[in-house]
């Protein structure tokens, strides 16, 4: 795989470096420029001279006016102005607005519900496997294994709170130490960021929208990965999280509090519990090595049960096994004792779809996974459509200005921190960082929120989810209070440390640059988004898991050369962009590597071959449906084929960008090809009425 896509004919020019306005943030960002960017998106991109460290030049045909894909699009209001409407028109418009708001809230509701069902589906499909990951004894000695288990389990159960609660119960039961639990919590933090990345994939239809949405979602991923990359070795070396949290727990005499308020669950639970209800204790029991739990179903059958505590007489091998000497007797042959047994009597069945089907967990999980993804996708499309029709012209300008504009000088720096607080507060309200960041993703996609603003909101979301965990810990029973609170605090301080690393100084906001880079690549090669998801959330963790099981020697033997190669490539890239003259001629570019190692183009050809046939069939079907629909509603402009079909048509026409002049972009070394040729202002003809 290429170190970075399309660096084939890179000829670094040490004399001049060019970059678009929305590019690499300088150390002291020009805030007026950002405001301008929000207001006037049609303006040509200004070229700024930059230090060599910020870009790499690649030869590509340079248009006279370059559209920066990271500029927010201006949503043109094609409707009649309010002042030009008559009374009837105004009333109609008002009710139309109310209708849109109701629809928006309705779709938003089902969007959140589908996220909940998606989590349940993942738990049914991979929950038991996730539980078994925890029963691995090597976690205690291998922090790297703990980390990947945290990632895998959270990805499999689609809920960091589930994996965290398993860790808490294991620590409470002394099956795990707090020290061993910290890497798992770090992994859970990474795993939880997959949800909004999946949500971003749903916006794959529009290139420019997808570029922004995917970058906005993956900024969370990169923040978590980079934080772990720095903080895991620091924690292993110093145990600072363990020490700080231990001091806090020991210095305060906490009294059991109340449960964190379930604000969003109150609204969504009535619906989601009609679809499926899970017995989440089963995963915890598997993690605690309970053999009986392995055969239990995660699908809850009985919702109303009567638990009767009774004493029964049982035989024991010897009097030493008696519950107490006074509760010990003999029948002359065997020793007997009295045991407290909890007899569970099933009273009423749960009221959900799958209660009487008696299907295996995998089948129920697969059904729910497909359905929830369809609903998620459908809701997202509708939310984007409604928002697109509402956020036009003046409304869009006001909203974008409000969200993306900074405080006046000298308080501009405070804006981001306020956004962190807003993110934390919103997450605390919805009780889920996944829900908040997933709701944020389409807003980034349609251009309401900039990535620069979404970043602190996401960081705040990370904090918000830990405050919820702290409140939940305070509500734990006596024996679990200490361990659950310490773990929740570890999670909190880990995120605080991450923010301190990757937010205060604009230069250190690497996750934004990396996310934009990935957004550029994924917009051009949309299959790469799925590839990224599989690699980062499944293959890498599973590989590390497998190597860890093989032992330290194998892990080091494979890991060290891989890390060495990555460092070597990064160093080489850094030298190529900053001071290429110190390098031999051959190493000044990547041409010495075969094309498949330095470009995604050959890989794209392979992927296109596989998907092409399916795409063709899909598009033919799409066109037939569209034409039938248009005939029925007698509206020639009411419907368009999906974006994929347009792209397919473009590809068939054989349009290509000739390589000529140098141009650079915001990501450290991303080519024009990765940038994607579809401009941000790609307008579509559609009816504004819903």
């Amino acid at each position: 795989m290429a170190p970075w896509p399309e660096l084939g004919d890179a000829q670094p020019n040490p004399d001049k470096y060019l970059e678009g306005a929305a590019g690499q943030q300088p150390t002291a960002p020009d805030k007026s420029k950002e405001t301008n960017k929000t207001d006037n998106t049609e303006a040509p991109v200004t070229k700024i001279e930059l230090l060599p460290s910020y870009s790499t030049a690649t030869l590509i045909d340079e248009p006279t006016e370059v559209d920066d894909p990271w500029n927010l699009p201006t949503l043109q209001d094609s409707g009649i102005k309010w002042s030009e409407r008559d009374t009837k028109g105004k009333i109609l418009c008002f009710f139309q607005g109310i209708g849109r708001l109701i629809l928006l809230l309705g779709f938003l509701y089902f969007f959140v519900c589908s996220l909940d069902i998606l989590s349940s589906a993942f738990q049914l499909v991979g929950g038991k496997m996730a539980g078994q990951f925890f029963s691995n004894s090597s976690i205690m000695s291998n922090p790297l294994l703990g980390l990947v288990i945290g990632v895998l389990v959270t990805v499999l159960v689609q809920s960091s709170s589930t994996s965290t609660s398993i860790v808490v119960s294991m620590v409470s039961s002394s099956l795990l130490t707090v020290r061993a639990a910290i890497p798992i919590i770090m992994g859970a933090n990474i795993g939880t960021s997959i949800t909004n990345t999946i949500v971003a994939l749903m916006q794959v239809g529009d290139r420019s929208e997808f570029r922004r949405a995917f970058a906005g979602a993956t900024v969370h991923d990169f923040f978590n990965w980079l934080s772990v990359l720095v903080l895991l070795p620091v924690e292993v070396a110093t145990h600072y999280l363990e020490i700080i949290t231990q001091l806090i727990v020991e210095s305060f005499h906490f009294k059991n509090g109340e449960d964190a308020p379930d604000l969003l669950k109150v609204i969504t639970k009535p619906f989601t519990k009609l679809i499926v209800q899970l017995d989440k204790k089963v995963i915890s029991q598997i993690a605690m090595n309970d053999e009986k739990a392995k055969n239990k179903s995660l699908v809850k059958i009985w919702c109303k049960t009567f638990t009767n505590k009774t004493q029964i007489n049982v035989t024991v091998p010897s009097t030493a096994n008696c519950t107490s000497p006074s509760l010990c007797w003999t029948d002359g042959i065997q020793n007997w004792t009295m045991k407290n047994v909890t007899y569970k009597e099933n009273i009423a069945k749960c009221q959900h779809i799958f209660v009487n089907f008696h299907l295996p967990d995998l089948a129920v999980g697969t059904i729910l996974l497909i359905l929830s993804l369809l609903v998620l996708c459908g809701c997202l499309i509708m939310i984007v459509k409604i928002l697109g029709s509402v956020l036009k012209g003046q409304v869009a300008t006001v909203i974008k200005k409000t969200i993306n504009t900074d405080f006046p000088f000298p308080f501009a720096w405070l804006t981001g921190y306020l956004a962190i607080l807003v993110g934390a507060g919103m997450t605390f309200i919805v009780q889920s960082s996944s829900v908040f960041t997933s709701a944020l993703t389409p807003l980034i996609g349609i251009g309401v929120i900039t990535i620069e603003r979404a970043y602190p909101l996401t960081l705040g979301s990370n904090i918000g989810t830990t405050t919820t965990a702290i409140l939940a810990a305070l509500a734990s029973p006596g024996n679990a209070l200490r361990s659950s609170l310490q773990i929740a605090l570890c999670h909190f301080f880990f995120n605080i440390s991450g923010i301190l690393l990757w937010y205060p100084i604009p230069f250190t906001r690497l996750p934004i640059r990396m996310a934009k880079g990935l957004g550029n690549i994924s917009a051009k090669y949309r299959w790469f988004a799925v590839f990224y998801l599989i690699i980062f959330f499944f293959l890498i963790p599973l590989t590390v898991f497998g190597l860890s099981l093989a032992g330290w020697r194998v892990l080091v033997g494979v890991g060290v050369p891989v890390v060495f190669i990555i460092i070597l490539v990064l160093c080489l890239r850094l030298l190529q962009s900053r001071c290429p003259r110190v390098l031999p001629k051959k190493l000044q570019n990547w041409n010495f590597l075969p094309l498949w190692m330095r470009s995604l183009k050959p890989w794209d050809a392979v992927v296109s071959k596989f998907t092409g046939c399916f795409q063709m069939r899909c598009c033919c079907c799409c066109r037939v449906c569209c034409r039938a629909c248009c005939l029925l509603c007698d509206c020639p402009k009411c419907c368009r084929c999906s974006k994929c079909c347009e792209d397919l048509e473009e590809a068939q026409e054989g349009q290509d960008v000739p390589v000529k002049a140098p141009e650079t972009f915001d990501n450290i070394t991303i080519s024009r090809e990765a940038q994607g040729e579809v401009p941000a202002s790609d307008s579509k003809t559609e009816c504004t009425a819903l």
Epitope: N313, S326, L327, W329, T330, D331, I333, Q334
Partner: antibody, heavy 119, light 107 residues
């Protein structure tokens, strides 16, 4: 109703052996333990041992171990006790008693078998 | 072995009297104690088990109490048929042991 009928009185010589029976009826023989209790003339009660007919498991009072052997025949619902190497101290009335399920109280007793050891 | 000591060994009482027989164990036996009645030439008959539970068919005038090491059998109002020898038995551990007996005679 539950009944335990024991074999008749025995007069034996010292050093000899005696095997007495206890035929049961009115309940499932294999579910309850069968206890054997000795009562010497003018003395109190002394537990010899017990057998669980279902599995043939036995337990003995250390004092009688090696001298008493308890067996059971499920087909005839009969319990047996064999006393060997008899001495004059073995002269007593021997009772079989049904143990209550799950504990050591004895709810039904046989009429007793009188054993006299005399030369 | 657990020793059980009954007191008194002999007891004279009249019909209608309230009689109490005690049984002391050499160690804690919980409530694993039974009481038996034996008439001359007859097999013992179970009266009480689990220290306090009356066996089926046993008149209500018989009651048991106690736990741990001290137990009592009480006959609230003596009847002519109640004159016999009474034994306590522990089944807390093997071997099962009986008290030496309390002989209840007519005054």
């Amino acid at each position: 109703q539950v009944q335990l009928v024991q074999s008749g009185a025995e007069v034996v010589k010292p050093g000899a052996s005696v095997k007495m029976s206890c035929k049961t009826s009115g309940y499932t023989f294999t579910t309850n333990n069968m206890h054997w209790v000795k009562q010497a003339p003018g003395q109190g009660l002394e537990w010899i041992g017990a057998i669980y007919p279902g599995s043939g498991a036995t337990a003995y009072n250390q004092k009688f171990k090696g001298r008493a052997t308890l067996t059971a025949d499920k087909s005839t619902s009969t319990a047996y006790m064999e006393l060997s190497s008899l001495r004059s101290e073995a002269t007593a009335v021997y009772y079989c008693a049904r143990g209550m399920y799950g504990h050591g109280a004895m709810d039904y007793w046989g009429q007793g078998t009188s054993v006299t050891v005399s030369s | 072995d657990i020793q059980l000591t009954q007191s008194p060994s002999f007891l004279s009482a009249s019909v209608g009297d309230r009689v109490t027989i005690t049984c002391k164990a050499s160690q804690d036996v919980g409530t694993a104690v039974a009481w038996y009645q034996q008439k001359p030439g007859k097999a013992p008959k179970l009266l009480i088990y689990w220290a306090t539970t009356r066996h089926s068919g046993v008149p209500s005038r018989f009651s048991g109490s106690g736990s741990g090491t001290e137990f009592t059998l009480t006959i609230s109002s003596l009847q002519p048929e109640d004159f016999a020898t009474y034994y306590c038995q522990q089944y807390s551990s093997n071997p099962l042991t009986f008290g030496q007996g309390t002989k209840l005679e007519i005054k």
